[in-house]
Amino acid sequence: EEELQVIQPEKSVSVAAGESATLNCTATSLIPVGPIQWFRGVGPGRELIYSQKEGHFPRVTPVSDPTKRNNMDFSIRISNITPADAGTYYCVKFRKGSPDVELKSGAGTELSVRAKPSAPVVSGPAVRATAEHTVSFTCESHGFSPRDITLKWFKNGNELSDFQTNVDPAGKSVSYSIRSTARVVLTRRDVHSQVICEVAHVTLQGDPLRGTANLSEAIRVPPFLEVTQQSMRADNQVNVTCQVTKFYPQRLQLTWLENGNVSRTEMASALPENKDGTYNWTSWLLVNVSAHRDDVKLTCQVEHDGQPAVNKSFSVKVSA
């Protein structure tokens, strides 16, 4: 009588998440009498995956009819595979008894689960920075397997090189996460710029996933201020103009001061956008020269995006 062998022909099986995994197992003999059970792992902590005898295993079905006479195929199919199913599975023959006695185990089949990375999420700095400053963008993607993954950064289509990437955990795991931080130097022209984090993985069949962030969320372009006087009008009124140019974002408050006293406050709203994404705003103040004996010091005070106010002054000459 030949000695019973339990044969698991595949050392490893790789399955995409959501699919079914078939784990093959055959026995070389019907004797001795007793059931086959499937376990994940070895030792006292091993997990029962399927038993012909008892238990409820809704995701596991035998590939061959276990009730058929002379059936020696004990392969199983596990449906709707997730990364948590990864591990080494053992087909184990028992001798019927009280309790059943473990006789022989197959060599094991390692199930690895190919899981797609989640869509990369790119987050920028919490506070805005101005041109010439460096800001950091972070890209995160989770839940992928196997561990090998490629991440690239682009700014306006140009690949970036100043970034640091970590894949966690470092050891073996059912699934992995990637986190990368890129450093980007801002310029005044970056309002319309975009950074892209691109993730390539074996599960994506050459079609990488991308996450984007707009630099408009990270940049502040401070305004230029210029105060000018138009020619005196016939009614002794002088028109003084404050031109606020090339600023971003639009959040701006302008205050006119006459000899240090607040004359008028305005808030920028619904401004047309420049080609580069910045805004311009012009404010006028009419000064009645005849109402003043001395020269009038006019100040255009601009508070942009919560930053300290910037002033530009102009003196209107009052002739004796």
């Epitope: 007793g34 038993s51 012909q52 058929k68 006479r69 059936n71 019927k96």
Partner: antibody, heavy 120, light 107 residues
Framework: QVQLVQSGAEVKKPGASVKVSCKAS????????ISWVRQAPGQGLEWMGW????????NYAQKLQGRVTMTTDTSTSTAYMELRSLRSDDTAVYYC?????????????WGRGTLVTVSS | DIQMTQSPSSVSASVGDRVTITCRAS??????LAWYQQKPGKAPKLLIY???NLQSGVPSRFSGSGSGTDFTLTISSLQPEDFATYYC?????????FGGGTKVEIK
């Protein structure tokens, strides 16, 4: 616990049909075959047929071919045996029994039996 | 079909006796033979499977032997609760067949 629970006793007239149910619990239903065995009063055990709870495949005793149908409902872990064109010699206790073909060839779990009386 | 012939059809014995029941298959069935005990009004109970393996919970005074065509069930020391009818059954192939039974009675 591991058990097979059968439906109650039946009294039928000759020519009628009877359907006996056998509800399994406490084990992996599709891992076993179910055989039906009957025993006429004072007689021995007679195997009627077998059904795979996995595939629904059946194998019937030659003498009952055409009169017997065995089915399973995996959603309720229940096996059924229907016997048609009943005769007086079909009066018997009908047992369902669990048998696991590839792993061992015996009936290790039995229902308590259903008495079917065929009488005009 | 494989015929199973059981003998004797009945045996009278006393408590403490050794009782032997034989079962012969009309063709070789390897070790695919089971023995059952049945008491009046009850379902059969599995005693021995695969010719010689004691079913869980069955007292060790019951034993089985044989292979191929000839098989034996032995009760080493008969107890009062052992008075019943015993059946052999072959599971080597369909149709499954039972022996005619052996009634163990009190002498």
């Amino acid at each position: 616990q591991v058990q097979l629970v059968q439906s109650g006793a039946e009294v039928k007239k000759p020519g009628a049909s009877v359907k006996v149910s056998c509800k399994a619990s406490g084990y992996t239903f599709h891992g076993y075959g179910i055989s039906w065995v009957r025993q006429a009063p004072g007689q021995g055990l007679e195997w009627m047929g077998w059904i795979s709870a996995y595939s629904g495949e059946t194998n019937y005793a030659q003498k009952l071919q055409g009169r017997v149908t065995m089915t399973t409902d995996t959603s309720t872990s229940t096996a059924y045996m229907e016997l048609r064109s009943l005769r007086s010699d079909d009066t018997a206790v009908y047992y369902c029994a669990r048998e696991a073909g590839s792993s061992w060839y015996d009936f290790d779990l039995w229902g308590r039996g259903t008495l079917v009386t065929v009488s005009s | 079909d494989i015929q199973m012939t059981q003998s004797p059809s009945s045996v009278s014995a006393s408590v403490g006796d050794r009782v032997t029941i034989t079962c012969r298959a009309s063709q070789g069935i390897s070790s695919w033979l089971a023995w059952y005990q049945q008491k009046p009004g009850k379902a059969p109970k599995l005693l021995i499977y695969a010719a010689s393996n004691l079913q869980s919970g069955v007292p060790s005074r019951f034993s089985g032997s044989g292979s191929g065509t000839d098989f034996t069930l032995t009760i080493s020391s008969l107890q009062p609760e052992d008075f019943a009818t015993y059946y052999c059954q072959q599971g080597a192939s369909f149709p499954i067949t039972f022996g005619g039974g052996t009634k163990v009675e009190i002498k």
